[in-house]
């Protein structure tokens, strides 16, 4: 069967919205970098749709994307990074819309990990420790960090502390003795990269300690 | 309406240094790719240099890799090209270029000379 729209599908391809998000990984799987383009209509039926690069690209001209599910992704070392790019969402030979883009500028970091909370006994505090991909990067290396904590049992309230180093210390007397926390982090590209928040880290979760009634302080 | 001017070239002996500079009056300045360009007498224009908008990523042609360095200041709309080892084959008119979209600089400088006698 052809890839290409017959008369009536492409009549009714053109009622239909398809704007789209993307947003590229650089160094994501070594030296390649990755692009990843959605259509923010989840509804909208993609049979025959496909999306395409081209422009500042080395060594070729276009790039197809490939269909997984419902996003289109390419992985490659051909991104020049450099300059404004045309992806569009094609339909045989046909445009249905189009958008330029700078690669630099929609990047979403990896999420962090390893992240972990030690509590600290003479220092009544809580040093907060997790690692990110993008410290052996040669792109986006300088990332601000979002770091989220809540005592587990209030839902949807969440602290949250920017920060640009991967460490950070909680001091005790701001969290609420012998109770359960639930902490994560994300990052977005700070210096030289624009673009989004990554994936949240997998949560860490840890107790804060008793008060001791005599001294009034933790246990 | 003059809006990218180069300046910097000159006469310089083989194995000297020049430093060109390109400066903006284009509002997209700081969102916008740079690059430099030449053309040798008889000879089509080459590419040597571009930088991204932020100036974290940069592309050299082989001729110049290594001897070339470029570099931007979005405070000041300019972007530089800093060029060592000379040879004489780097004799021409160097072109300043704005706005990398699709495979097309979109503006171009009027050039300055650059003649490297041995």
């Known amino acids: 069967e052809s890839g290409y729209a017959q008369n009536g599908d492409l009549e009714d391809a053109e009622l239909d919205d398809y704007s789209f998000s993307c947003y590229s990984q650089l160094e994501v799987n070594g030296s390649q970098h990755s692009l990843t383009c959605a259509f923010e209509d989840p509804d909208v039926n993609t049979t025959n749709l496909e999306f395409e690069i081209c422009g500042a690209l080395v060594e070729v001209k276009c790039l197809n994307f490939r269909k997984l599910q419902e996003i289109y992704f390419i992985e490659t070392k051909k991104f020049l990074l450099i300059g404004k790019s045309n992806i569009c969402v094609k339909v045989g030979e046909k445009s249905l819309t189009c958008k330029k883009i700078d690669l630099t500028t929609i990047v979403k970091p990896e999420a962090p990990f390893d992240l972990s909370v030690i509590y600290r006994e003479g220092a009544n505090d809580f040093v907060v420790t997790f690692n990110t991909s993008h410290l052996q990067k040669k792109y986006v290396k300088v990332l601000m960090h979002d770091v989220a904590y809540r005592q587990e049992k209030d839902e949807n309230k969440w602290t949250h502390v920017n920060l640009s180093s991967t460490k950070l210390t909680l001091l005790q007397r701001k969290l609420q003795p012998a109770a359960m926390y639930e902490i994560k982090v994300r990052s977005i590209p700070d210096h030289y990269f624009k673009g989004f928040w990554s994936e949240w880290s997998p949560s860490y979760y840890f107790r804060t300690p008793e008060i001791n009634n005599s001294s009034g302080e933790m246990d | 309406e003059v809006q990218l001017v180069e300046s910097g070239g000159g006469l310089v002996q083989a194995g000297g240094s020049l430093r060109l500079s390109c400066e903006s009056s284009?509002?997209?300045?700081?969102?916008?790719?740079m690059g430099w360009f030449r053309q040798a007498p008889g000879k089509e224009r080459e590419f040597l240099s571009a930088i991204g908008w932020s100036g974290a990523v940069t592309h050299y042609s082989d001729s110049v890799q290594g001897r070339f360095t470029i570099s931007r200041d979005n405070a000041k709309n300019t972007v530089y090209l800093q060029m060592n080892s000379l040879k004489s084959e780097d004799t021409g008119r160097y072109y300043c270029?704005?706005?990398?979209?699709?495979?097309?600089?979109?503006?171009w400088g009027q050039g300055t000379q650059v003649t490297v006698s041995s």
């Open positions: 284009i509002s997209t300045f700081s969102s916008d790719a």
């Open positions: 270029a704005e706005d990398y979209d699709t495979d097309v600089w979109q503006y």
